[in-house]
Structure formats: structure tokens, C-alpha cells
């Protein structure tokens, strides 16, 4: 969490941003909130990016003002116009690319004063893994698949019964480049699994950590998965 203040105390407002990550190919959100004003026409929102000459986005007098917008952001940005009045200056970014990573500044002017806060935005690819029993294999085998990751992640297997065990000798992980030649499909196979045990496939890079669990008993198979972004720090 980054909280920024204006320069002179009496005319400063609090602006808060949250470091976040964008999943390339999807739309992303750059979060920013500020002390609201009672009049929309008095609020100015400017989004800037370090190293970019033009503006990322500007919203003033109740509408977008995009004459100074940098070329790389044309048609790709929007604020939540109906939420500006309650202090939401978050920016929506269309079709996130690797090049969108960097330091952004959310700069706010209201009738109460000015304020700004920086935001570190990482870009990559991350997706939920799914673990299945591989019935085609000769021995009891688990297969963990996740469709999109970048940068290349690490994959670690763990089990509830054999806590602390190192499965690197009985697992095999491959990375297959997807059609857009950036992200990769992750496939990891775990051999010699035992019944009545819960196994976890953990995929992690510097942006996200995802886990796929599978519980295999004689009568049922239960699955669970979750994904966590690693750099969601507020500022």
C-alpha cells in the first residue's frame, strides 16, 4: 500500500495505490483511491507512467480528456466514471502487455488540494493449475496442468502424508510455448503416487503462486486449487 500526500499540509489530500500484477492478454486494474470531493467537476485524475512522455489517462470535469494521451495507451484505458465521485480513481487497462510493466503515478486534484502516489505494476502470466489422475500411465501417476505462465515458473510437488519429502526425482516438468510465443503451458507429472493421500502441485514465479491439490482415495477424487498474487502491496 502506498499512501501519498500533497506537498503543503493544508492543501494536501491522501491518495492510496496498491501494487498489482497484470495477466498479459487480459484487462488489468491499476488501483487508486483518494479523499472524495462533493463536486465531480472539481476532480482531476491523471495517470502517468515513468519513462512515458504523454499521459496514460486524464479525467477532468466529469469526463475523459485524452488529447495528451500517449500513443501506446490509446483506446486502452478507462476510469470507472460513476465511482470517481466516491474517491475511486482506479484505471482499467485493456489487453495487458509485457511492456505495460513499470512505475505508474496516480495524481489527483480536488477542491481540497492535491496528492499523488506511485504504483508498481508487474506483468506476466499466471493461471490456475488442475491436477488429474493420469489413467494412461503404466503406474499411478498425477498430471498437473496450467495453461498460461510467464516468466517460467518453478513447479514443486508436496504430499500431506510425506511432508517435507523431495519429489524432484519422481516428477517431470515441461514447458510448452503457447501460440502467441510469450506465455507457456506448464505440465508436471508425478509418478508412483499412493492412494489415500493428498498431493499438491505448487507453481510459482515472481508474480504469482498457484496450488492445485488432489485427494485420491479408493472411492473418490477431490480437487481444489487457488492462486495468489505475490506483490499486492498497498502504498
Amino acid at each position: 500500500l502506498i499512501i501519498g500526500f500533497g506537498i503543503s499540509g493544508r492543501h494536501s489530500i491522501t491518495v492510496t495505490t496498491v501494487a498489482s500484477a497484470g495477466n498479459i492478454g487480459e484487462d488489468g486494474i491499476l488501483s487508486c483511491t483518494f479523499e472524495p470531493d462533493i463536486k465531480l467537476s472539481d476532480i482531476v485524475i491523471q495517470w502517468l507512467k515513468e519513462g512515458v512522455i504523454g499521459l496514460v489517462h486524464e479525467f477532468k470535469e466529469g469526463k475523459d480528456e485524452l488529447s495528451e494521451q500517449d500513443e501506446m495507451f490509446r483506446g486502452r484505458t478507462a476510469v470507472f466514471a460513476d465511482q470517481v465521485i466516491v474517491g475511486n480513481a482506479s484505471l482499467r487497462l485493456k489487453n495487458v502487455q509485457l511492456t505495460d510493466a513499470g512505475t505508474y503515478k496516480c495524481y489527483i486534484i480536488t477542491s481540497k488540494g492535491k496528492g499523488n502516489a506511485n504504483l508498481e505494476y508487474k506483468t506476466g502470466a499466471f493461471s490456475m493449475p488442475e491436477v488429474n489422475v493420469d489413467y494412461n500411465a503404466s503406474s499411478e501417476t498425477l498430471r498437473c496442468e496450467a495453461p498460461r505462465w510467464f516468466p517460467q515458473p518453478t513447479v514443486v510437488w508436496a504430499s500431506q502424508v510425506d511432508q517435507g519429502a523431495n519429489f524432484s526425482e519422481v516428477s517431470n516438468t515441461s514447458f510448452e510455448l503457447n501460440s502467441e510465443n510469450v506465455t507457456m503451458k506448464v505440465v508436471s507429472v508425478l509418478y508412483n503416487v499412493t492412494i489415500n493421500n493428498t498431493y499438491s502441485c505448487m507453481i510459482e514465479n515472481d508474480i504469482a503462486k498457484a496450488t492445485g491439490d488432489i485427494k485420491v482415495t479408493e472411492s473418490e477424487i477431490k480437487r481444489r486449487s487457488h492462486l495468489q498474487l505475490l506483490n499486492s502491496k498497498a502504498s
Epitope: E26, D27, G75, A78, R148
Partner: antibody, heavy 123, light 107 residues
């Protein structure tokens, strides 16, 4: 009411280039919307080809990226599609469509469509 | 790319009855899903966006639900003009992709 109208040759030779234009009326191509091309082979489903913003920014479907060019002509309020090295597999109805963007909403669904034009690739 | 799978391929329902069409995404698309209706010789027509928001002028008998990977389009009381092909489309991830369609026919 926004209207879109596709135009261009209905027959293209294999290995040639398919060229289509979409004329926009009842609204400005310089609005906040993206403008798309979508195709539908006879009796089959829909496939997004690519999209363009009035500034010239584009997104192309990776499966067609090496063969596709979409351009915009703001003075004529129209945008165009070029698809090179065509084969019989490119025979389809080609639609132009407008992205349904409204402030704060996501981009990507299509609220206005042209009536479509059938392009056949054959010698 | 995200693969959208619609079921059933064909659905036979009598006028006045309820129709339920399903759409599944190969990975989460959040609520970024649209439904279209297409009649023979016509362009698709937007019915639903945001998984559940009806487009302008669409009758209340059309409703959408779901999020993540599982979505449903429900037509509460079928009218004669509702028999057509229905497509779902995800716009969470580029390239935007469509399902293969469900043909709704008169029983």
C-alpha cells in the same frame, strides 16, 4: 443508431489477398469504441480476426496475425481488412462489428454488427 | 486461447416452455461473457453482456447467469421468434473466442 456496412469482392483467388472495407454511419469511428472483424465459415461458428482503435492501435488473433492487416480511415469514417495468402479455409461470411464499450465497462463484446459479406476463395 | 464449449449442440423445446443453454470456458473468464442470437442469413445479435446484463431492448424473458467457467442462458417462456442459434463469447482474454453454438429448435 450506428450502422455498419461491409463491402469488397465476393470471390478471391487462392494465394491472393482478401480486401474488405466497413463503412460506419450514424456514429463516429473516432469514438471510444474499438472496431472489429469477425468471420464465420458457412455453417460453422464465429472467429474474431482482429480489432482497431481510431488511433491505429490494433490487436490481431495470433492464429491469423502473420496474414492480417486492419487499418482505419478517419476521414471516410471506415476501417478495412486485408488477409493475405488466402486458401479455401478462409471462405467465410466476414462481419464488421463495434465493440460495446461504455465508460467503466469492459471492452470486448459486440453491440453493433454489419450484415456480413460472403467471401469465397476459389480459382 | 480460451476454448468455449456450449451444450447441448441442439435443444428441442416447445413454445411457451423454458430453455436452458450452457457455456463452459476452458479457464476462468470472470464475468466477461456475452450471449448472442443468430437467425439464418442474419448477423449475430447481442443479448447479454457481463454474464447477466441484458443489452438494450432485449426482453426480460432472456436472462444470463454464472461466472468463472460455467455460464447459463435461460429463456423463460419461448416465443416463436426465439428459435435460432445461440453463441456465447468470452472477452476476458484476447483473442476473444466464441462457443460453437447451440441450435434451439421447435419440438
Amino acid at each position: 443508431q450506428v450502422q455498419l456496412q461491409e463491402s469488397g469482392p465476393g470471390l478471391v483467388k487462392p494465394s491472393g489477398t482478401l480486401s474488405l472495407t466497413c463503412a460506419v454511419s450514424g456514429g463516429s469511428i473516432s469514438s471510444s469504441n474499438w472496431w472489429s472483424w469477425v468471420r464465420q465459415p458457412p455453417g460453422k461458428g464465429l472467429e474474431a480476426i482482429g480489432e482497431i482503435y481510431h488511433s491505429g492501435n490494433t490487436n490481431y488473433n495470433p492464429s491469423l496475425k502473420s496474414r492480417v492487416t486492419i487499418s482505419v480511415d478517419k476521414s471516410k469514417n471506415q476501417f478495412s481488412l486485408k488477409l493475405s495468402s488466402v486458401t479455401a479455409a478462409d471462405t467465410a461470411i466476414y462481419y464488421c462489428a463495434r465493440d460495446g464499450y461504455s465508460s467503466g465497462w469492459y471492452w470486448g463484446y459486440f453491440d453493433y454488427w454489419g450484415q456480413g459479406t460472403l467471401v469465397t476463395v476459389s480459382s | 486461447e480460451i476454448v468455449m464449449t456450449q451444450s447441448p449442440a441442439t435443444l428441442s423445446v416447445s413454445p411457451g416452455e423454458r430453455a436452458t443453454l450452457s457455456c463452459r470456458a476452458s479457464q476462468s473468464v470472470n464475468s466477461n461473457l456475452a450471449w448472442y442470437q443468430q437467425k439464418p442469413g442474419q448477423a449475430p445479435w447481442l443479448l447479454i453482456y457481463g454474464a447477466s446484463t441484458r443489452a438494450t431492448g432485449i426482453p426480460a424473458r432472456f436472462s444470463g447467469s454464472g461466472s468463472g467457467t460455467e455460464f447459463t442462458l435461460t429463456i423463460s417462456s419461448l416465443q416463436s421468434e426465439d428459435f435460432a442459434v445461440y453463441y456465447c463469447q468470452q472477452y476476458n482474454h484476447w483473442p476473444y473466442t466464441f462457443g460453437q453454438g447451440t441450435k434451439l429448435e421447435i419440438k
